[in-house]
């Protein structure tokens, strides 16, 4: 495929990646299969500029983004390394609480309504951001 | 790599305490739950306690509640279980294990005998 | 607090067979629920999460099902490493409860 050059109608340009801000909401399995769909994955915040850029778009609004730990470890869903990389959690977070009442503990992480992130139960049904690299191979064939 | 070593076990008489410690490495200690989970001679895993990764939730099992406290240094990475009024009963290898039991540590033998 | 039946205590298999080993919940768990082997003198090791998922670097002849009260986990092909002892663990609700295990021995 060839090389993605501009974003797509109705996604942001910001810094080689594009992302496009849902307004409805999705549990989080199906927020993450909604931007795998759209050849996208949830948004994976890299940097403290990233984490502001997302947080003016999104506004105080509980918005998943691609960090879970259903498996295990904390995972960020494009391989993006969790232990080496920018953390943002509200204080005292993640919690995996589990007084929720809802079974289980918290294992998907969504910003919170200051930006800062917290671990929630992946069924919430909230909105959600993706991202797809500018520079990354498109699924279109090439042009002959 | 993923790391957990339980230290503290040995014998103890009815009535004592012991302070068993985990130290972790390789990962983010404060991002996740810790657990200690125990298994008697020749027995089966029991769970007995958790605590949150900032420390603020922590359970335990009715069989040792009241003398058992879990509790968590981030600072050091270290996960503690401070046992008091042993019994014969408590005798067990307990192990530390990380959130949902997805790493385990390779336990340490606590005895409780006069 | 939420009781994890574990079924059978024991079994007999030759390598090659197909084992299954059943966990029931005395109350519904969605599917928060692990299963753990374990060797003598050793710690346990988590194979499956979530009652279906394989661990990772676990081998796919094990694998597992069920949803709300009943879990099974199935070993396709049995080998020579696979005896040991198998728990279910449920992370659902607190306390948490391991079942009473299955240890598979060779026949």
């Known amino acids: 495929g060839s090389e993605r050059t501009c974003c797509p109608v109705n996604w942001v340009e910001h810094e080689r990646s594009c992302y496009w801000f849902s307004r409805s909401g999705k549990a989080w399995a199906d927020a993450d299969n909604y931007c795998r769909l759209e050849d996208a994955h949830l948004v994976v915040v890299t940097s403290w500029e990233e984490q502001k850029f997302v947080q003016h778009h999104i506004g105080p609004v509980n918005t998943w983004m691609g960090l879970h730990d259903q498996n295990g470890p904390w995972k960020w869903v494009d391989g993006t390394d969790y232990e080496t990389g920018f953390k943002n959690w509200r204080p005292e977070q993640p919690d995996d609480w589990y007084g929720h009442g809802l079974g289980g503990g918290e294992d998907c992480a969504h910003f919170t309504d200051d930006g800062r992130w917290n671990d929630d139960v992946c069924q919430r049904p909230y909105r959600w951001v993706c991202e797809t690299e500018l520079d990354k191979a498109s699924q279109e064939p090439p042009l002959l | 790599e993923v790391q957990l070593v339980e230290s503290g076990g040995g014998l103890v008489k009815p009535g004592g305490s012991l302070r068993l410690s985990c130290a972790a490495s390789?990962?983010?200690?404060?991002?996740?739950?810790m657990n200690w989970v125990r298994q008697a001679p020749g027995k089966g895993l029991e769970w007995i306690s958790s605590?949150?990764?900032?420390?603020?939730?922590?359970y335990y099992a009715d069989s040792v509640k009241g003398r058992f406290t879990i509790s968590r240094d981030n600072a050091k990475n270290s996960l503690y279980l401070q046992m008091n009024s042993l019994r014969a009963e408590d005798t067990a290898v307990y192990y530390c294990?990380?959130?949902?039991?997805?790493?385990w540590g390779q336990g340490t033998l606590v005895t409780v005998s006069s | 607090d939420i009781q994890m039946t574990q079924s059978p205590s024991s079994l007999s298999a030759s390598v090659g067979d197909r084992v299954t080993i059943t966990c029931r919940a005395s109350?519904?768990?969605?599917?928060?629920l692990g299963w753990y082997q374990q060797k003598p003198g050793k710690a346990p090791k988590r194979l499956i999460y979530?009652?279906?998922n394989l661990q990772s670097g676990v081998p796919s002849r094990f694998s597992g099902s069920g949803c709300g009260t009943e879990f099974t986990l199935t070993v396709s092909s049995l080998q020579p490493e696979d005896f040991a002892t198998y728990y279910c663990?449920?992370?659902?609700?607190?306390?948490?409860?391991f079942g009473q295990g299955t240890k598979v021995e060779i026949k």
């Open positions: 294990a990380i959130s949902s039991g997805w790493s």
């Open positions: 390789g990962f983010t200690f404060s991002s996740y739950g």
């Open positions: 605590i949150s990764g900032s420390g603020s939730y922590i």
């Open positions: 109350q519904g768990i969605r599917n928060d």
């Open positions: 979530t009652a279906s």
């Open positions: 663990l449920q992370h659902n609700s607190y306390p948490w409860t």
